[in-house]
């Protein structure tokens, strides 16, 4: 698929890896919160 225009911004190039890591970390935290919530609901 075509790259979004923002990928042309130098910032995208310089921060791509850290932004991807930050997003992965955020998703992991979200998944952890969801698990905790399910545990509470399940009790």
């Amino acid at each position: 698929s075509e790259e979004p225009p923002i990928s042309l911004d130098l910032t995208f190039h310089l921060l791509r890896e850290v932004l991807e890591m930050a997003r992965a970390e955020q998703l992991a935290q979200q998944a952890h919160s969801n698990r905790k919530l399910m545990e509470i609901i399940g009790k």
């Epitope: 042309l8 911004d9 310089l14 921060l15």
Partner: antibody, heavy 118, light 112 residues
Framework: EVQLQQSGPELVKPGASVKMSCKAS????????MKWVKQSHGGSLEWIGV????????FYNQKFKGKATLTVDKSSSTAFMQLNSLTSEDSAVYSC???????????WGQGTLVTVSA | DVLMTQTPLSLPVSLGDQASISCRSS???????????LEWYLQRPGQSPKLLIY???NRFSGVPDRFSGSGSGTDFTLKISRVGAEDLGVYYC?????????FGGGTKLEVK
Amino acid sequence: EVQLQQSGPELVKPGASVKMSCKASGYTFTDYFMKWVKQSHGGSLEWIGVISPNNGDTFYNQKFKGKATLTVDKSSSTAFMQLNSLTSEDSAVYSCARGTDRALFAYWGQGTLVTVSA
Amino acid sequence: DVLMTQTPLSLPVSLGDQASISCRSSQSIVHSDGNTYLEWYLQRPGQSPKLLIYKVSNRFSGVPDRFSGSGSGTDFTLKISRVGAEDLGVYYCFQGSHIPWTFGGGTKLEVK
């Protein structure tokens, strides 16, 4: 013409928080990341963080994690920065800036002066 | 963090003279992609910073050719061949190769 118009000066009490804005015009807001910079009274410049107006992804200078929160409103092409638990150390001019495909800080807002005082 | 050290702190010049500002990084600022993301900015009194030079030696659009940037690795220089009144202000170097991105402390160009 690329323009970044920032909100006016703020006088706030220690411990309070402040939210400033940066309205972009003259280009497609979602095509470029927005950065924020702190300029202390002595003149030194510090990069605070960056936000993608596209999807709201943020990345912060470790020094400003927990101090600054960056958000955007795509409908009004406006970026925001909230600073919390303010102390006298946070008294400074805060600027938003946009890059290009070649440089990181090609266009700057005029800055918002924040004064923290009891 | 990469420390960017500028010298001199203050540079008194006569209009029409050449000025030279040095910027030294605490470690190499060659990015893993091979580029060196070293930029120069001028902040005139009461104004926001303006981009002059990007990637060490490239002038940004509208910047006069009397401004030139050079250097590599850890040592960089900004030269102004004929200083005009509009060139007075504080010059900052900046590196975007390593996170966190960092600015130099500034060099004030003023009339002698």
